[in-house]
């Protein structure tokens, strides 16, 4: 898919039409990050339990297993985000795949994802008022990681 | 930060100026996902070695430790992406934080990130030729995860 660059719009960071014309969202749709879960979702139900599988996708084979929770908002771009939810407080033993090892903690890896919300612009009123795309950083957990507990100084 | 929607640009998916005016990439920079490393980069040199620290950022405390490698392309938006590079083939022992445990593999978690490349538009020539933003999925490794090896059926 190509976005064709044409002349006639010299300040694109603020060059977007009023709501009636609609294209900025079309454009944002292309420019937003791909947000389906990084790994194929688990085919087996045990991905929802605190155990490390010997098959299936990475999130179910990890000794810090996680599931993906959908976070959907039709008035946000991207509309769909997926949060990794750790299924165990500690890491699962590599030997058994089920017993937890208190020497390791299963913790989420967080990332600040840029998202956009549509807001009426300040001071704009009436039927043809302009809209602002409000950029926000939105915390998303990408995965769960097995770490050694932090030693306090 | 707000992006103000103004009138006067009725086809935003294809409304971008020629290269000399530069704004489309500025705008894309805002609209693309935040791509700095999820964790603060480690200040200590041991993050680059195959061991699990007891302090520091998550990528150095993980028993599947990783470093972040910068991937910069000035003709891509975002220009900077960070790839997680696993520092160990196997997971580090929770007990020692240094010896590797062959029962676990340290593997990257991949994600298809939407990126844009700037390309001359087909059939466009001359000094004021227009440019196209080509949307592509680009594989990025987000982190390294300790998993039980896959058992082949």
């Amino acid at each position: 898919v190509s976005l064709r660059i044409q002349e006639g719009c010299s300040h694109l960071p603020s060059c977007c039409p009023s709501k009636e014309q609609e294209p900025p969202e079309e454009w944002l749709k292309w420019s937003s990050a791909s947000v389906s879960p990084p790994e194929p979702l688990s085919h087996t139900h045990h991905a929802e339990s605190c155990r490390a599988s010997k098959d299936g996708p990475l999130n179910s084979r990890a000794i810090s297993p996680w599931s993906y929770e959908l976070d959907r908002d039709l008035n946000r771009v991207p509309q769909d985000l997926y949060h990794a939810r750790c299924l165990c407080p500690h890491c699962v033993s590599l030997q058994t795949g089920s017993h937890m090892d208190p020497l390791g903690n299963s913790v989420p890896l967080y990332h600040n994802q840029t998202v956009f919300y549509r807001r009426p612009c300040h001071g704009e009123e009436g039927t043809h008022r302009r809209y602002c795309l409000e950029r926000r950083l939105y915390r998303v957990s990408l995965a769960c990681v097995c770490v050694r507990p932090r030693v306090m100084a | 930060v707000s992006l103000r929607i103004q009138e006067g640009c009725s086809h935003l998916p294809s409304c971008c100026p020629s290269k000399e005016q530069e704004p489309p990439e500025e705008w894309l920079k805002w609209s693309s996902a935040s791509v700095s490393p999820p964790e603060p980069l480690s200040h200590t040199h041991h993050a680059e070695s195959c061991r699990a620290s007891k302090d520091g950022p998550l990528n150095s405390r993980a028993i599947s430790p990783w470093s972040y490698e910068l991937d910069r392309d000035l003709n891509r938006v975002p220009q900077d992406l960070y790839h997680a590079r696993c520092l160990c083939p196997h997971c580090v022992s929770l007990q020692t934080g240094s010896h590797m445990d062959p029962l676990g593999n340290s593997v990257p978690l991949y994600h298809n990130q939407t990126v844009f490349y700037r390309r001359p538009c087909h059939g466009e020539e001359g000094t004021h030729r227009r440019y196209c933003l080509e949307r592509r999925l680009y594989r990025v490794s987000l982190a390294c995860v300790c998993v039980r090896p896959r058992v082949m059926a």
Epitope: K19, E22, E25, E26, L28, K29, S36, P37, P40, L41, S42, H43, T44, H45, A47, E48, S67, E69, L70, D71, R72, D73, L74, N75, R76, V77, Q79, D80, Y117, R118 | -
Partner: antibody
């Protein structure tokens, strides 16, 4: 009672465009989204996409994303679905449905359907 | 895309019977599954959302269960007005997808 009332049946030639309307009433339009679903004769349901009524943000099914545009008009609480470059396999009943804007994306109220026939 | 497979494709049961329809997703969809009833020439009607929540106004004889990949719609005591096609839908990943439907006939 929530109501979604759709425009009437259409007969189009291949290559033409069709624009179906969906007038919503008896609820706060901007608090929901509108989804569009079609059903070819004797076939199952196919999701085409949706739009957040407040934001106008859309998500389209890949199969039709190059040919479809969904819009809303808050002043008349009406949603529109335009499909361009029609083909014979676009012949179907097109439904609009109300959808919540959050994670629980169920379609709790539906329009009566609009039959679009594409034939040369 | 996630495939939704319903079984059986059709069934015939008597008034008062307990009827069970299953829906299987090609991958884990957590609890993001809805059930609809569709009668000939009519729009679908929501029965169950998020796998087990009963939509307002739907009779208590309808219930839903399951999570992950396997889901069930149960009609505890079939009534004459329950004929029609029952359709499952996943909403976990776009594109949203529907099952092929189970046609329920009254004996």
């Amino acid at each position: 009672q929530v109501q979604l009332v759709q425009s009437g049946a259409e007969v189009k030639k291949p290559g033409a465009s069709v624009k179906v309307s969906c007038k919503a009433s008896e609820y706060t339009f901007s608090n929901y989204g509108i989804s569009w679903v079609r059903q070819a004769p004797g076939q199952g349901l196919e999701w085409l996409g949706w739009i957040g009524a407040y934001s106008g943000f859309t998500k389209y099914a890949q199969k039709v994303q190059d040919r479809i545009t969904m819009t809303t008009d808050a002043s008349t609480t009406t949603a529109y679905m335009e499909l361009r470059n029609l083909r014979s396999d676009d012949t179907a009943v097109y439904y609009c449905a109300r959808v919540g804007t959050g994670t629980d994306s169920y379609f709790d109220f539906w329009g009566q359907g609009t039959l679009v026939t594409v034939s040369s | 895309d996630i495939q939704m497979t319903q079984s059986p494709s059709s069934l015939s049961a008597s008034v008062g019977d307990r009827v069970t329809i299953t829906c299987r997703a090609s991958q884990n969809i957590n609890s993001h599954l809805n059930w609809y009833q569709q009668k000939p020439g009519k729009a679908p009607k929501l029965l169950i959302y998020t796998a087990s929540s009963l939509q307002s106004g739907v009779p208590l004889r309808f219930s839903g269960s399951g999570s992950g990949t396997d889901f069930t719609l149960t009609i505890s005591s079939l009534q004459p007005e329950d004929f029609g096609i029952y359709i499952c839908q996943q909403t976990y990943i776009t594109p949203l997808t529907f099952g092929g439907g189970t046609k329920v006939e009254i004996k």
